[in-house]
C-alpha cells in the first residue's frame, strides 16, 4: 500500500478542535485524490468524514461535516471540530489516488486524539 | 530491579488534575516504602514529589506538594494537581522498599500525562 504518515498523538483544544497533517508518498502524478478520516474504537471502524479534491484545489467536505481541510502537494491539513471526551479515539487517515489510473490506496497508522470536556463556567449571577 | 507498573497514558481533567495507579511487585514484606514521581521531558528528569509511608498508613507528601496519594497493599493511587499544558510529559513512578533490609528499587515505564489548558470563561459583566 501507499505510505501515509500522520502524527501518533494530538490533543483536542478545550473547544473540541483537533488538527493534524496527513502526508502521503504518491507513486505518480495523481490529479484526483480522496481523503477519508476513519475512527477506530473498540475494534469498530466508522467513517468520520471524506473529501475528494483535484490537485491544487481546496478540499470540499459536505456542509454538515465536522471536518475541514486544506491541501498542499502531498500533504492534507485536517481539522475535526465539535469533539467531546467520548470522541477520544484513533483517527485513521485513508488516502486514495482516484485518477488517473491506476488506483493507489494508503492507510495511516492513526492519530490518537485525546479530548477532555471543559468544566462548565460558573453562572454569572 | 523490582517490577513497577503504571498506565501508559492519562489525561488531566480540565481542572488540571491527573490521577494514576502505581503498582509494584514486592519481593518481601516491606514495612517502609518510598514513592517518588519523576517528570521526564526533553531528556531532562526532574522530581515532582515524593513520600515515604509505613505499610497500612497514609502517604504523606510535603504541605506544598502538588501530589496527594493513598496506598492499598502494593498499590499507590497518585494524584497530581495544578497541571498546565506546559506540564504535559512522562511521569515516572519510582518505588523503593526502605525497611527492613534488603533495599529494593523499581522504576515504572512512565505515564504520559496530557494536559490541555481550559478556555477562559467569559467575563460576567
Amino acid at each position: 500500500a501507499m505510505h501515509v504518515a500522520q502524527p501518533a498523538v494530538v490533543l483536542a483544544s478545550s473547544r473540541g478542535i483537533a488538527s493534524f497533517v496527513c502526508e502521503y508518498a504518491s507513486p505518480g502524478k495523481a490529479t484526483e485524490v480522496r481523503v477519508t478520516v476513519l475512527r477506530q474504537a473498540d475494534s469498530q471502524v466508522t467513517e468520520v468524514c471524506a473529501a475528494t479534491y483535484m490537485m491544487g484545489n481546496e478540499l470540499t467536505f459536505l456542509d454538515d461535516s465536522i471536518c475541514t481541510g486544506t491541501s498542499s502537494g502531498n500533504q492534507v491539513n485536517l481539522t475535526i471540530q465539535g469533539l467531546r471526551a467520548m470522541d477520544t479515539g484513533l483517527y485513521i487517515c485513508k488516502v486514495e489516488l482516484m485518477y488517473p489510473p491506476p488506483y493507489y490506496l494508503g492507510i495511516g497508522n492513526g492519530t490518537q486524539i485525546y479530548v477532555i470536556d471543559p468544566e462548565p463556567c460558573p453562572d454569572s449571577d | 530491579a523490582m517490577h513497577v507498573a503504571q498506565p501508559a497514558v492519562v489525561l488531566a481533567s480540565s481542572r488540571g488534575i491527573a490521577s494514576f495507579v502505581c503498582e509494584y511487585a514486592s519481593p518481601g514484606k516491606a514495612t517502609e516504602v518510598r514513592v517518588t514521581v519523576l517528570r521526564q521531558a526533553d531528556s531532562q528528569v526532574t522530581e515532582v514529589c515524593a513520600a515515604t509511608y509505613m505499610m497500612g498508613n497514609e502517604l504523606t507528601f510535603l504541605d506544598d506538594s502538588i501530589c496527594t496519594g493513598t496506598s492499598s497493599g502494593n498499590q499507590v493511587n497518585l494524584t497530581i494537581q495544578g497541571l498546565r499544558a506546559m506540564d504535559t510529559g512522562l511521569y515516572i513512578c519510582k518505588v523503593e522498599l526502605m525497611y527492613p533490609p534488603p533495599y529494593y528499587l523499581g522504576i515504572g515505564n512512565g505515564t504520559q500525562i496530557y494536559v490541555i489548558d481550559p478556555e477562559p470563561c467569559p467575563d460576567s459583566d
Epitope: A1, P27, V45, P102, L105, I107 | -
Partner: antibody, heavy 115, light 107 residues
C-alpha cells in the same frame, strides 16, 4: 493507447531458468508500480511479484510460492519490467501477465515447465 | 498474509437476473478491494476499484459495495456477455492476493 506486451515465454525443463520481459507504452511507466500475475491451467489468478517505482526506492515484494526463485526488475529508461525465473517447477506452468498496478494488463505469455 | 475467501465458487443464473458475488477478508482492508472479470483466452479486466468505484468503460450493470472485511460485486441484470470468471483482490497489502474466483454461467 495503453499497451503492455509480454515476451520470453516458452518451454523449459524443470530446474531451468527463463526471463520474461514486458514492454509498456501509452502511459507514464515510471509513475507506476509494476506486477506479475499468473494463471496456471485450471487455476485462478495468482499474484507473483511487485516492483515499486523511484519514490518507493524500487522496493520489491514476492508471493511465498516464488520468493527466492523469481526476481522482478525494471528499466524505466526502456519502459520495461522483467521477471527472472530460476529453479522452475512443473507447477510454474501457466500464462504470465504483467500489469501496471492492476489497471492495465498485457495479453500474457505462456510458460510451460515440462521434461 | 491476508486471506481472501470468495463465494460461491460457481453459479448459474438466467439472463436478466440480479447476481451477487461475495468476498471476505481475514482482516480489515479499509475498502482496498478490486474486482476483475476474466473471459477465456483474454486478459483480466478491472471492473471495480476501491470496493465501490466503477472502472472506466465498464457497464453500469456492475457495482461494488462493502467495507471492513465483507465485500460484494453485484450485476444488476445479467447479460450473455457477462459469462466469465470473477475475482476479488486485496490491494491494501504489500502482497495483493486474489480470491479463488467465481465462475459465472448462463442457465
Amino acid at each position: 493507447e495503453v499497451q503492455l506486451v509480454e515476451s520470453g515465454g516458452g518451454l523449459v525443463q524443470p530446474g531451468g531458468s527463463m526471463r520474461l520481459s514486458c514492454a509498456a507504452s501509452g502511459f507514464t511507466f515510471s509513475d507506476n508500480w509494476m506486477n506479475w500475475v499468473r494463471q496456471a491451467p485450471g487455476k485462478g489468478l495468482e499474484w507473483l511479484a511487485q516492483i515499486r517505482n523511484k519514490p518507493y526506492n524500487y522496493e520489491t515484494y514476492y508471493s511465498a510460492s516464488v520468493k527466492g526463485r523469481f526476481t522482478i526488475s525494471r528499466d524505466d529508461s526502456k519502459n520495461s519490467v522483467y521477471l527472472q525465473m530460476n529453479s522452475l517447477k512443473t507447477e510454474d506452468t501457466g500464462v504470465y501477465y504483467c500489469t501496471a498496478q492492476f489497471a492495465y494488463w498485457g495479453q500474457g505469455t505462456l510458460v510451460t515447465v515440462s521434461s | 498474509d491476508i486471506q481472501m475467501t470468495q463465494s460461491p465458487s460457481s453459479l448459474s443464473a438466467s439472463v436478466g437476473d440480479r447476481v451477487t458475488i461475495t468476498c471476505r477478508t481475514s482482516e480489515n482492508i479499509y475498502g482496498g478491494l478490486n474486482w476483475y472479470q476474466r473471459k477465456p483466452g483474454k486478459s483480466p479486466k478491472l471492473l471495480i476499484y476501491g470496493a465501490t468505484n466503477l472502472a472506466s468503460g465498464v457497464s453500469s450493470r456492475f457495482s461494488g459495495s462493502g467495507s471492513g472485511t465483507d465485500y460484494t460485486l453485484t450485476i444488476s441484470s445479467l447479460q450473455p456477455e457477462d459469462v466469465a470468471t470473477y475475482y476479488c483482490q486485496n490491494v491494501l497489502s504489500s502482497r495483493p492476493g486474489f480470491g479463488s474466483g467465481t465462475k459465472l454461467e448462463i442457465k
